[in-house]
């Protein structure tokens, strides 16, 4: 018996608008109906929770209103989007998946997605 496998891309480059999207896919050992997905950021030996959502299989993924994350789910796949990123937010973003119900509980952690964020150059002043 091993930990539940979670797959995510190794590297993602955020858009010039500070938006990064990636897929988190998990190999469910059972028929979970309630799943919790958490995005963690590891950088400079610090770990912070970026966002988290619990969803019922077949329903929409709902984050808190003030969350910087949005997402959709399809089967054992979660499509995550993180917004409002700046260069200082560059780091390893880890997908943590917990199968909450029905028992037994399972935990899986991905190997992390390195998200690179490059702040856009300010537009040069124009006389026009």
């Amino acid at each position: 018996c091993k930990a539940m496998h979670v797959a995510q891309p190794a590297v993602v480059l955020a858009s010039s608008r500070g938006i990064a999207s990636f897929v988190c896919e998990y190999a469910s050992p059972g028929k979970a109906t309630e799943v919790r997905v958490t995005v963690l950021r590891q950088a400079d030996s610090q770990v912070t929770e970026v966002c988290a959502a619990t969803y019922m299989m077949g329903n929409e993924l709902t984050f808190l209103d003030d969350s910087i994350c949005t997402g959709t789910s399809s089967g054992n796949q979660v499509n995550l989007t993180i917004q409002g990123l700046r260069a200082m937010d560059t780091g390893l973003y880890i997908c943590k998946v917990e199968l909450m119900y029905p028992p037994p509980y399972y935990l899986g952690i991905g190997n992390g997605t390195q998200i690179y964020v490059i702040d856009p150059e300010p537009c040069p002043d124009s006389d026009f």
Epitope: C1, K2, A3, M4, T38, L40, Q42, S45, Q46, V47, T48, E49, L92, I94, K96, E98, P104, Y105, L107, G108, I109, N111, G112
Partner: nanobody
Framework: EVQLVESGGGLVQPGGSLRLSCAAS????????IGWFRQAPGKERETVAC??????SYADSVKGRFTISRDNAKNTVYLQMNSLRAEDTAVYYC??????????????????????WTQGTQVTVSS
């Protein structure tokens, strides 16, 4: 699936010792980091120590006093607590995390990475 059961809590005088055990069933401990955490009344749950196949890591507040070890044959992790102080009084939890290549000595014990939490065992240090 992994199931963890901890034992060994109790009442001890300052300067005394206790040993907590965390026994795993349903899986070998090998692919997991096992951590000990504690929560005192009105405070956040905090890291005490954790161990994987080759490394251990401790909170500064317990270094030199607590020792974490694992017995793979018994599928059990132990927390030997010596020179106990009143401030060590808390509910102690055992939890597991899949061992990952990006874990560092500083992050492998971080509570965000853990699941399979036990119910907790009370440790009270008082005279």
């Amino acid at each position: 699936e992994v199931q963890l059961v901890e034992s060994g809590g109790g009442l001890v005088q300052p300067g005394g010792s206790l040993r907590l055990s965390c026994a795993a069933s349903g899986s070998t401990l090998d692919p997991f980091v096992i951590g000990w955490f504690r929560q005192a009344p009105g405070k956040e749950r905090e890291t005490v120590a954790c161990i994987n196949r080759s490394r251990t890591s401790y909170a500064d507040s317990v270094k030199g006093r607590f020792t974490i070890s694992r017995d793979n044959a018994k599928n059990t992790v132990y927390l030997q607590m010596n020179s106990l102080r009143a401030e060590d009084t808390a509910v102690y939890y055992c939890a597991a995390s899949p061992d990952k290549p990006f874990y560092t000595d500083q992050t492998m014990c971080n509570k965000h990475y853990y699941g399979y939490w036990t119910q907790g065992t009370q440790v009270t240090v008082s005279s």
